[in-house]
Every structure is written in structure tokens, then in C-alpha cells.
Interface confidence: low
């Protein structure tokens, strides 16, 4: 008979014959022959293969490198890779999350518009007129100036984007 030119699903063509692929979690040791089936071996610890394959080497699990701010979110198995995520207080520097950096703080005069997440940095906004922030923080929003009037006081010193207003007593001498 003519040798096959294509093989069924989960098979591969070698030396004019169809051999079974190795299942996920196993690597190829030797191809099948006329007399023997494909020989496969389980991946070692810290290795994986996630598809039906004819790979002679398993892939190393991804290393969640603490120097890059990464930690293990989900431990890998013989069939799945390790999933990394950023340490708390850090966020990914790219969509692939191959490294992380510390959430930035908003400087005095700026408040937090959006608190950082594991995948996005802190978003800061300038404190508008009537609001201030006197701290460098990754959490604090701009605070409204104190309302002197509601306390029956007057403004003694105007507020800025970095300082609150200073209230003082009404001038008793005025009519």
C-alpha cells in the first residue's frame, strides 16, 4: 500500500508512517516503528507540555522572579505553565506581565484619580481650585478646602492645591 501523506488527529507522520503523539504532560522518547508504539515519558518536576506533542524536551515552568516584583499566582503542573502575578503594591509593566514596578504615589498638589491595580498604575490628577493634597500618597484623593463659613469663621489664609485654608474668628470690630 502507498505510505500515508496525512495522519489522523493526535498522530504525526514520520518515516512514512503515522505515530501517536504524546499526551499533554509527557514528552517524546522514541518514535513508533512497525513493531513498537510511540514511547513517551512524563515531564519532570518544574516542567510542562500543554498540548498533544512530539517534543523531546518539556518546557520549563515560568519563573516568577521576585527581582521583577513577581510572585506565583497559580503553580504549574505537568500540563500547565505557572501563572505569575505582581506582588501587592506593584503592577505589571506590560500586558504580558513579565515584570512589575511599584505603584507610584501622587505628589502634594495632586490626588489619586484611580487607585492602582495589579495591571494598572496609580492615576493622579491635579487638585482643582477648592481642593488640596498635602501628602505624597498612592491612595489619598484631593480633599476639599475647609468651609470657614459653616464654622462661623472667616478665611484668614487662602488655600492652595497643596494647603488647606486657614480659618479664624470674625473681626468683632466690624459692624
Amino acid at each position: 500500500p502507498e505510505p500515508p501523506t496525512a495522519c489522523r488527529e493526535k498522530q504525526y507522520l514520520i518515516n512514512s508512517q503515522c505515530c501517536s503523539l504524546c499526551q499533554p504532560g509527557q514528552k517524546l522518547v522514541s518514535d513508533c516503528t512497525e513493531f513498537t508504539e510511540t514511547e513517551c515519558l512524563p515531564c519532570g518536576e518544574s516542567e510542562f507540555l500543554d498540548t498533544w506533542n512530539r517534543e523531546t524536551h518539556c518546557h520549563q515552568h515560568k519563573y516568577c522572579d521576585p527581582n521583577l516584583g513577581l510572585r506565583v499566582q497559580q503553580k504549574g503542573t505537568s500540563e500547565t505553565d505557572t501563572i505569575c502575578t505582581c506582588e501587592e503594591g506593584w503592577h505589571c509593566t506590560s500586558e504580558a506581565c513579565e515584570s512589575c514596578v511599584l505603584h507610584r504615589s501622587c505628589s502634594p498638589g495632586f490626588g489619586v484619580k484611580q487607585i492602582a491595580t495589579g495591571v494598572s498604575d496609580t492615576i493622579c490628577e491635579p487638585c482643582p481650585v477648592g481642593f488640596f493634597s498635602n501628602v505624597s500618597s498612592a491612595f489619598e484623593k484631593c480633599h476639599p478646602w475647609t468651609s470657614c463659613e459653616t464654622k462661623d469663621l472667616v478665611v484668614q489664609q487662602a488655600g492652595t492645591n497643596k494647603t488647606d485654608v486657614v480659618c479664624g474668628p470674625q473681626d468683632r470690630l466690624r459692624a
Epitope: P66, N67, E87, W90, E98, L102
Partner: antibody, heavy 119, light 112 residues
């Protein structure tokens, strides 16, 4: 003002042990920094020894430092310690405490503490 | 692990002039830009000047400029002043699963 200060250096005999302490002032470990130890032999370059993630306590060691050096932290005291054992003359150096907030860049350093290993 | 090779010491610079120090890595640094530069004066700890190859650290004068990518990096100091006399170190982070951190051997800058 953010500062780091090392202590615990001094003269120690070969095969001896020493524990160095780094005190952080002006910032909290809950701010999620890496705290590291770097050393510098007299007249030589810089060498990273070990780091600890101040928030979770996860550690990293240079391969040559594994086994003889142990890094740990105390969040309540805002300190990082480096325990050194089986010291040799080659460990004579100034030991610096340094902080990293990402990109493997050290933005804050202590003045250093000198460790001399000699008989 | 990567080996970082710096311009041999000492390098001479004239006040008001420009000086460049090179740093060559035996392997590409992480993301092609995870390289930093430090200034160290005798009896003092290193001071961060540049990180991510070209980003100026807080409080560092813009006379200091970092450039380069992959394996070749340069620190350039323009309008040199006497206070720039120091030893300069590059530091790179190469890759996971290795002793990825490496410091260069240092380059001494002498200001005349």
C-alpha cells in the same frame, strides 16, 4: 527624610558569624519595597548578596550566598537583618543596605558598615 | 550570568567639558533597558543617577544622560564640574533563573 542605617559590623575571626541590621527611617516596609544587601570589598566593585520583599517576606539570594547568608525582616521594627556564617577573609567588605522600588535600581542606600574577617 | 565591562579607569575630564563612560553587557539586559548607573565617592555609598538605561533619578542634574539598549550603554556627563569626580558603576539585570544581577567594575572619573 528617608534613610537607611546599617549596624553590626566589626572584626570577626575566620569561620565566625555576624549579624548585620539595617534600620529604615522615613518610610514603611508596608510600602512594598525590596530591601537588599550589597557588599564592596576594599578598593573593589559592588556585589549583590540578597534581597527580601519587605511586604511579603519573599527572598532572593545570589547563588554564591545561599547557605551561608540569611536575610530576614521585622516589619514592626522596620529592620532587615543579614546573618552571615562561616566567614572567610574574602568576606571582608563594607556591607550596604539598599532599597529597590523596581527596574532593579537601588534608589536609597545606607552609609555602610565595615566587616573585617581576620585572625 | 551577564558580565558588565566598563571603560577602563581612570577617565579624565576637563571642567566644563563632556565625558562619556561605556558599559558593555555580555548578554542583553532584561527588556533591553534594565540598566542603571551609580555615582560613588570615597567613603560614601553609591548614589542612583539613571535607571531604565535613560531615566534620570529624582534630584539628579540633567547634565547626566544615559543612553543605549540591549548590550551597549553609555553614561554622558556634560558641563563637567569638580563635584563630578567619582567612580561610576553600571548595574544590569539580565534574566530570570540566573544570577541576573551584575555590577560593572567601575570607572573613575578625574576632573582637571
Amino acid at each position: 527624610q528617608q534613610q537607611l542605617e546599617e549596624s553590626g559590623g566589626g572584626l570577626v575571626k575566620p569561620e565566625g558569624s555576624l549579624t548585620l541590621t539595617c534600620k529604615a527611617n522615613g518610610f514603611s516596609f508596608s510600602a512594598n519595597y525590596y530591601m537588599c544587601w550589597v557588599r564592596q570589598a576594599p578598593g573593589k566593585g559592588l556585589e549583590l548578596i540578597a534581597c527580601i520583599y519587605a511586604s511579603s517576606g519573599s527572598t532572593w539570594y545570589a547563588s554564591w550566598a545561599k547557605g551561608r547568608f540569611t536575610i530576614s525582616k521585622s516589619t514592626s521594627l522596620n529592620t532587615v537583618t543579614l546573618q552571615m556564617t562561616s566567614l572567610t577573609v574574602a568576606d571582608t567588605a563594607t556591607y550596604f543596605c539598599a532599597r529597590s522600588g523596581g527596574y532593579a535600581a537601588y534608589d536609597l542606600w545606607g552609609p555602610g558598615t565595615l566587616v573585617t574577617v581576620s585572625s | 550570568a551577564a558580565v558588565l565591562t566598563q571603560t577602563p579607569s581612570p577617565v579624565s575630564a576637563a571642567v566644563g567639558g563632556t565625558v562619556s563612560i561605556s558599559c558593555q553587557s555580555s548578554k542583553s539586559v532584561y527588556n533591553n533597558n534594565w540598566l542603571s548607573w551609580y555615582q560613588q565617592k570615597p567613603g560614601q555609598p553609591p548614589k542612583l543617577l539613571i535607571y531604565r538605561a535613560s531615566t534620570l533619578a529624582s534630584g539628579v542634574p540633567s547634565r547626566f544622560r544615559g543612553s543605549g539598549s540591549g548590550t551597549e550603554f553609555t553614561l554622558t556627563i556634560s558641563d563637567v564640574v569638580c563635584d563630578d569626580a567619582a567612580t561610576y558603576y553600571c548595574a544590569g539585570y539580565e534574566s530570570v533563573n540566573t544570577d541576573g544581577h551584575a555590577f560593572g567594575g567601575g570607572t573613575e572619573v578625574v576632573v582637571k
